[in-house]
């Protein structure tokens, strides 16, 4: 009988398609958006009208397409009305305010900036870490990594003085340099003197 050969060994199928060998011949099963014997041809979905609604412009992409919507419409097919704050584009707890038919403004929480509040403001340029402390940025605050003999949020407390920390902030602990970093979240656990 004839020798069986695996026609898929040469990886003839392109663009992520699946190869199978049938009677010593390869057969490619294409992913959506590709065509041809080896799935080498990108289907231009934009040749078929009606993909993008409400006057949206069709943009062909490898294996897919994208609709660029006219002002006032949104969604994959430009089939939805655009409402600036629904859903809110503001992140990090920012509050969205509609400023026009198609415009919005994000009111950011303290510590964040950017048109959608996407950036955490670096608080270290204005830091006040004392006694050789090194600043580490937080959210609308900063923390200080203290050298071994100092502790507290701002490295103002002498470790050797025990628990004589600044009022309502910190409890002195003998912590190694690399661990001596006080985060704001700890505040709730500190007792009043």
């Amino acid at each position: 009988g004839s020798q069986w050969t695996d026609a898929c060994l040469s990886h003839p199928c392109a663009n992520g398609s699946t190869c199978t060998t049938v009677a010593n011949q390869f057969s490619c099963k294409c992913l959506t958006g590709f065509t041809g014997q080896k799935c080498e041809t990108d289907v231009n979905e934009c040749d078929i009208p009606g993909h993008c609604q409400h006057g949206g412009t069709c943009l062909n992409l490898p294996g897919s397409y994208q609709c660029q919507c006219l002002q006032g419409f949104t969604g994959q097919y430009c089939d939805s009305l655009y409402v600036p704050c629904a859903p809110s584009p503001c992140v990090n707890g920012g509050t969205c305010r509609q400023t026009g038919d198609f415009t919005f403004e994000c009111n950011c929480l303290p510590g964040f900036e950017g048109s959608t509040c996407e950036r955490n403001i670096d608080d270290c340029p204005n830091h006040r870490c004392q006694n050789g402390g090194v600043c580490v940025d937080g959210v609308n605050t900063y923390n200080c990594r203290c050298p071994p003999q100092w502790t507290g949020q701002f490295c103002t407390e002498d470790v050797d003085e025990g628990n004589s920390g600044l009022n309502d902030i910190f409890e002195a602990q003998k912590i190694e340099w690399h661990e001596n970093l006080y985060f704001q979240g700890h505040h709730h656990h500190h007792h009043h003197h």
């Epitope: 004392q130 050789g132 600044l166 902030i169």
Partner: antibody, heavy 120, light 107 residues
Framework: EVQLVESGGGLVQPGGSLKLSCAVS????????MEWVRQASGKGLEWVAA??????????VYSASVKDRFTISRDDSKSTLYLQMNSLKTEDTAVYYC???????????WGQGTLVTVSS | DIQMTQSPSSVSASVGDRVTITCQTS??????LAWYQQKPGKSPKLLIY???RLQDGVPSRFSGSGSGTDYTLTISSLQPEDFATYYC?????????FGGGTKVEIK
């Protein structure tokens, strides 16, 4: 005993320049943040500029009102802090104090002050 | 910048009176607050740091309290040498900011 002594104040015309000095003694200069604070006659205290310590690479911060006009610097070999003031305005008229940031988030030592008068 | 609202701007009191001065900050300063005393023609003098810690050499009739955004300086029994102007200052971050001052005058 910690001591800070300012000098260099005087009368200068608007647009002019002046360099203030602050000679310090009684502590290791490079270990401390140093600040300039000013006070117009009959008014409150206004922070002007700061230079952090050696551990913080002697980094510098300015108030918005003097940024790009004033320059803070220090000479550790002379234990002296400086404030170079350029493009002076009448509103810069004040007593200028040099102070030490004592590692407590507070200014624990102050000089006697030097008067700067900007007038034509 | 952190805003400092100090009140009252002036207070008339007698020797032996208890005097209270308040300072409110526009954001949490984590007890990084100092109080200073200034007499006419003199440099400011540090009284309290860390909101409640008494600076060395300062009489115990001066005390500080508070946390977050609200702070208080108390003179328990006013002495003749205490008639002066008092300033609060936040040390949490630059730019350092001062309260407008409170003048303690003789009644």
């Amino acid at each position: 005993e910690v001591q800070l002594v300012e000098s260099g104040g005087g009368l200068v015309q608007p647009g002019g320049s002046l360099k203030l000095s602050c000679a310090v003694s009684g502590f290791t200069f490079s270990d401390f943040y140093m600040e300039w604070v000013r006070q117009a006659s009959g008014k409150g205290l206004e922070w002007v500029a700061a230079q952090r310590n050696k551990a913080n690479d002697f980094s510098i911060v300015y108030s918005a009102s003097v940024k790009d006009r004033f320059t803070i610097s220090r000479d550790d070999s002379k234990s002296t802090l400086y404030l170079q003031m350029n493009s002076l305005k009448t509103e810069d008229t004040a007593v200028y104090y040099c102070s030490r940031d004592g590692g407590k988030l507070a200014l624990d030592a102050w000089g006697q002050g030097t008067l700067v008068t900007v007038s034509s | 910048d952190i805003q400092m609202t100090q009140s009252p701007s002036s207070v008339s009191a007698s020797v032996g009176d208890r005097v209270t001065i308040t300072c409110q900050t526009s954001e949490d300063i984590y007890s990084g607050l100092a109080w200073y005393q200034q007499k006419p023609g003199k440099s400011p003098k540090l009284l309290i740091y860390g909101a409640s810690r008494l600076q060395d050499g300062v009489p115990s009739r001066f005390s500080g309290s508070g946390s977050g955004t609200d702070y208080t300086l108390t003179i328990s029994s006013l002495q003749p040498e205490d008639f002066a102007t008092y300033y609060c200052q936040q040390g949490f971050k630059y730019p350092l900011t001062f309260g407008g001052g409170t003048k303690v005058e003789i009644k």
